[in-house]
């Protein structure tokens, strides 16, 4: 059996090498001699010779200064033989423990840690952490036991122990109150890390701490009165231009500027801030009226875009504006005029009378008449007194210049101010109809096949109005009916078929047809037919010669 | 019942006319147009022209145009074909038809053809 | 003016066979109407405006077509359809009837 005590060496011992470790010693030994080996890592394995064994006497030995923290274990296998090389014993594992020194200080992970607080933020605010490490043995002896500490703080204001460090974890934390970005923006600590609980080796690095901005400033109004003009009538005019500060950010929440109007419950105007330098600019929501109101006092009110993180109070302005008189428009009462009129309407009688106000009371102003659009020139206007009588006749029918029987008519007033003013008011004549269209066929040139023709439906089309318009009436006349007939094509007989009444040779006839309408306004209308060379439906043809009452004649 | 009469044959020598008849019956003869078609021994049919009965309108093929001449008369409900300077390739069955070119077609009646022999 | 041809110019059928005879037309047409011709008689009209049986014909012929190509179809040929068949446009001046074909029965 093997004889080993427990093996330990300390690191960095001195000379002189090599040194004693333990003797290691087999029991067979006093059955006869016994010669000792050792092998593995440190013997005869990298590295090579640092332990050797004095091989009669079992004295093992350590040949040079060990470093633990590159090897902190040795693992070695003891070995015994007799004099003529029998093992007497089986290999023995020995653990050769390298014992610790405090021969490594620690090292903080970074040179420059970097963390950020709000401004204003409470103590026991955590704002960052650093962290070191140390490569000594911190199982078995406090050689790696780093604690933390603040050597320096810049600025040292507004106290010179802002700051605070846990000794055990590098946590960071706000200690006094008083953290203000606009005052001090960014903080300075050189921090400290110390083996053996701080006692022992020690190094440095530096803590930079951004104070991040809140939102403890207001915007504050400078100059706080402010004088503008604007002609009346005129929206999204600039009146004038509304100046703060805010010490806060740049151009963060904090720092933008809303401005409020307290005072403006008609809507009357707007501020809108600049991007740029968060100016307030004052403009016209709607036009004013300068004959309701001709000064408006008006108080703003300057907060953020976010709110305020402390209570703080709102600056305010004042802003006297003064409207300006302009020459206005006559303004036509109602701006849009219907008056019904029946289409036979005497000439030269007066329809209507349509007038304007004249808007500037403060003025007195003539207003003259007269017509701006009158497309079929059916109306003339008395300059004087707006009086609106007939010129022509009036034609519901006239489709050019009637739309769903309405005539529009434009009538302009102007004024005698400086700059003359000119309104415009819209006459709708709606004209009721009367009988004076009779009914035409639609269309009017017709195509039949000379072999095996279709019918042609033909419709009736009368530019009146009900009951001025079907059912009609449809009849062949001047002797069309000898080779043509027609039937009505519908219930309310507004189409006809026309087809003839025998086969019929290629070329153009002439048939009268006759249609009245409901209330018995009749037109005898020609319709022009023409016979191709075809066989059944007939698209369009060449003409021939006409054909008096649907028969030809010879030429 | 609708009836195209023609005579069966008719013989006339090189150069010479004839003049080809169509007696009808049975339907009011200026209501409908009659057409004239020519069909040679063993060939198709050829069409040569028609006339309206009641106005004397007359329409022919351009390869005919020289050669036949249609005529009626009203009174007699016959229809005529003059054929002129005929050869041996006149020589061939016409035939009368009568057509409803107002309707679909569907009444078309034909005579029994008379053969035209030219021969010296 | 309008040529039709007719295709095939000669043909033979068996009893109950379907039989079809077309009819090309130079330019486009409107209807085409057929017409059967017997040796030694007048030509009937068959079919008029493209599809229209006329009075008398059987059922088993039937017509179709459009444009410039047109067709007679009898279902099941019989003995007594054998006959020549002739196509006729009348959709303009001059009145054109295809060459004929001849159908016999086998």
């Known amino acids: 059996d093997w004889v080993i005590p427990p093996i330990s060496c300390p690191e960095n011992e001195k000379g002189p090498f090599p040194k004693n470790l333990v003797q290691i010693k087999s029991n067979k030994d006093k059955e006869g001699k016994v010669f000792y080996s050792i092998t593995g890592q440190g013997a005869d394995t990298p590295p090579v010779g640092v332990f050797i064994i004095e091989r009669e006497t079992g004295w093992l030995k350590v040949t040079e200064p060990l470093d633990r923290e590159r090897i902190a274990t040795y693992t070695l296998f003891s070995h015994a033989v007799s004099s003529n090389g029998n093992a007497v014993e089986d290999p023995m594992e020995i653990l050769i423990t390298v014992t610790d020194q405090n021969d490594n200080k620690p090292e903080f992970t970074q040179e420059v840690f970097k963390g950020s607080v709000m401004e204003g933020a409470l103590p026991g605010t955590s704002v960052m952490e650093v962290t070191a490490t140390d490569a000594d043995d911190d199982v078995n002896t406090y050689n790696a036991a780093i604690a933390y500490t603040i050597l320096s703080q810049d600025p040292e204001l507004p106290d010179k122990n802002m700051f605070t460090i846990n000794r055990n974890t590098g946590v960071i934390s706000v200690v006094t109150t008083g953290l203000d970005r606009e005052s001090f923006p960014t903080y300075t600590l050189v921090v400290q890390a110390a083996d053996l609980q701080g006692e022992g080796l020690s190094t440095t690095a530096t803590a930079v701490i951004t104070v991040t901005d809140t939102n403890d400033n207001p915007p504050i109004f400078n100059p706080t009165t402010y004088k503008g003009q604007v002609p009346e009538n005129e929206a999204n005019v600039v009146i004038t231009t509304l100046k703060v500060t805010d010490a806060d950010a740049p151009n963060t929440p904090a720092w933008e500027a809303v401005y409020t109007i307290l005072n403006d419950d008609g809507g009357q105007f707007v501020v809108t801030t600049n991007p740029v330098n968060n100016d307030g600019i004052l403009k016209t929501a709607k036009g004013l009226d300068f004959e309701a109101k001709q000064q408006y006092i008006l108080h703003v009110a300057v907060t953020n875009v976010v709110p305020f993180e402390v209570s703080l109070t709102t600056s305010t302005a004042t802003v006297t504006v003064d409207v300006l008189d302009v020459n206005e428009a006559p303004i036509f009462v109602p701006p849009e005029k219907r008056v019904e009129v029946s289409e036979d309407f005497g000439v030269g009688q007066e329809i209507t009378s349509y007038t304007a106000q004249e808007p500037d009371t403060f003025m007195e102003q003539k207003i003259t008449y007269r017509i701006w659009r009158d497309t079929a020139n059916w109306l003339e206007i008395n300059p004087d007194t707006g009086a609106i009588s007939t010129r022509a006749e009036l034609d519901r029918e006239d489709f050019e210049h009637v739309k769903n029987s309405t005539y529009t008519a434009l009538i302009i007033a102007t004024d005698n101010g400086s700059p003359v003013a000119t309104g415009t008011g819209t006459l709708l004549l709606i004209l009721s109809d009367v009988n004076d269209n009779a009914p035409i066929p639609e269309p009017r040139t017709i195509f039949f096949c000379e072999r095996n023709p279709k019918p042609q439906v033909i419709n009736i089309i009368d530019a009146d109005l009900p009951p001025n318009t079907s059912p009609f009436t449809a009849e062949l006349t001047h002797g069309a009916s000898a080779n043509w007939t027609i039937q009505y094509n519908d219930p309310t007989q507004e189409s006809i078929i026309l087809k003839p009444k025998m086969a019929l040779e290629v070329g153009d006839y002439k048939i009268n047809l006759k249609l009245m309408d409901n209330q018995n306004k009749d037109q005898v209308t020609t319709l022009e037919v023409s016979v191709c060379d075809c066989e059944g439906a007939a698209g369009v043809c060449r003409k021939a010669q006409p054909v008096e009452a649907g028969l030809q004649i010879p030429a | 019942q609708v009836q195209l009469q023609q005579p069966g044959a008719e013989l006339v020598k090189p150069g010479a006319s004839v003049k080809l008849s169509c007696r009808t019956s049975?339907?009011?003869?200026?209501?409908?147009?009659i057409h004239w078609v020519k069909q040679r021994p063993g060939r198709g049919l050829e069409w040569i022209g028609r006339?309206?009965?009641?106005?004397?309108?007359?329409k022919y093929n351009e390869n005919f145009k020289n050669k036949a001449t249609l005529t009626v008369d009203k009174s007699s409900n016959t229809a005529y074909m003059q054929l002129s300077s005929l050869t041996s390739e006149d020589s061939a069955v016409y035939y009368c038809?009568?057509?409803?070119?107002?309707?679909?077609?569907?009444?078309?009646?034909w005579g029994q053809g008379t053969s035209v022999t030219v021969s010296s | 003016q309008i040529v039709l041809t007719q295709s095939p110019a000669i043909m033979s059928a068996s009893p109950g066979e379907k039989v079809t005879i077309t009819c090309s037309a130079s330019s486009s047409v409107s209807y085409m109407h057929w017409f059967q011709q017997k040796p030694g008689t007048s030509p009937k009209l068959w079919i008029y405006?493209?599809?229209n049986l006329a009075s008398g014909v059987p059922a088993r012929f039937s017509g179709s077509g459009s444009g410039t190509s047109y067709s007679l179809t009898i279902s099941r040929m019989e003995a007594e359809d054998a006959a020549t068949y002739y196509c006729q446009q009348r959709s303009t001046y001059p009145y054109t009837f295809g060459g004929g074909t001849k159908l016999e029965i086998k």
């Open positions: 038809t009568r057509e409803d070119s107002y309707g679909p077609f569907d009444l078309d009646y």
């Open positions: 049975g339907y009011s003869f200026t209501s409908y147009w």
């Open positions: 006339i309206v009965p009641n106005s004397g309108g007359t």
């Open positions: 405006s493209t599809s």
